[in-house]
Amino acid sequence: SETTTGTSSNSSQSTSNSGLAPNPTNATTK
């Protein structure tokens, strides 16, 4: 059975990219 997430709407939802850095770099080793 399919699990869906997000809210219901008649139009397309915008996916929030706000959880990820815009220009990410690799983690540095300390």
């Epitope: 997000g6 915008s14 990219n17 959880g19 990820l20 850095a21 690799n26 983690a27 540095t28």
Partner: antibody
């Protein structure tokens, strides 16, 4: 209603290949940064790969463990993202989820690498 | 890689009582634009993960306001002000500041 539906999983032998597909609906797919994340009892949740949108030149990022073996791609006209998995290893076994930048998630498709 | 360490591994909470989960990162998650890309996800039994919170404290649409996130740099907290039966499951923190994106090991929330 937002739906991300993965397909293409199954049983594959070590060294083999498989291609996963994720069909999105109810979402403005062309704007989404798309990721594949896998889950296994041994490693928990593990990020695999990401492909960004056209304004970001469809840049791709990969986990070190899959670099050179896996390829992420997308087709905005079909609202689909793919994961081509080559030279599979037993440690690649798990449930593979596609997700829009960790926002919306699909139900997952199972990949088992075993002889 | 950034290591995300969650505590406790599990907690058992009575309905209506508060719950708190800690997440610590091995490096500061503060990005050069001043934002901190720390997310909280919920995975109910038999379901896929769902994001609750992004950028430390911003609630995703449709998420009840009994959930809240706080913290900075390397120390973060997810709080549920009044636990409900539907909150049972595993909660994960996840960082989106540095590649590769990494997840905490999860905290299992059980209902007493």
């Amino acid at each position: 209603e937002v739906k991300f539906e993965e397909s293409g999983g199954g049983l594959v032998q070590p060294g083999g290949s498989i291609k996963l597909s994720c069909a999105a609906s109810g979402v403005t797919f062309s704007e989404a940064w798309m990721d594949w994340v896998r889950q296994s009892p041994e490693k928990g949740l593990e990020w695999v790969a990401e492909i960004r949108d056209k304004p970001n030149s469809y840049v791709t990022y990969y986990a070190e463990s899959v670099k050179g073996r896996f390829t992420i791609s997308r087709d905005d006209s079909k609202s689909r993202v793919y994961l081509q998995m080559n030279n599979l290893r037993t440690e690649d076994t798990g449930i593979y989820y596609c997700t829009g930048a960790m926002d919306y998630w699909g139900q997952g498709t199972s990949v088992t690498v075993s002889s | 890689d950034i290591v995300m360490t969650q505590t406790p591994l599990s907690l058992s909470v009575t309905i209506g009582q508060p719950a708190s989960i800690s997440c610590k990162s091995s490096q500061s998650l503060l990005y050069s634009n001043g934002k901190t890309y720390l997310n909280w996800l919920q995975q109910r039994p038999g379901q896929s993960p769902k994001r609750l919170i992004y950028q430390v404290s911003k609630l995703d649409p449709g998420i009840p306001d009994r959930f809240s996130g706080s913290g900075s740099e390397t120390d973060f907290t997810l709080k549920i002000s009044r636990v409900e039966a539907e909150d049972l499951g595993i909660y994960y923190c996840m960082q989106g500041t540095y590649l590769p994106w990494t997840f905490g090991g999860g905290t299992k929330l059980e209902i007493k």
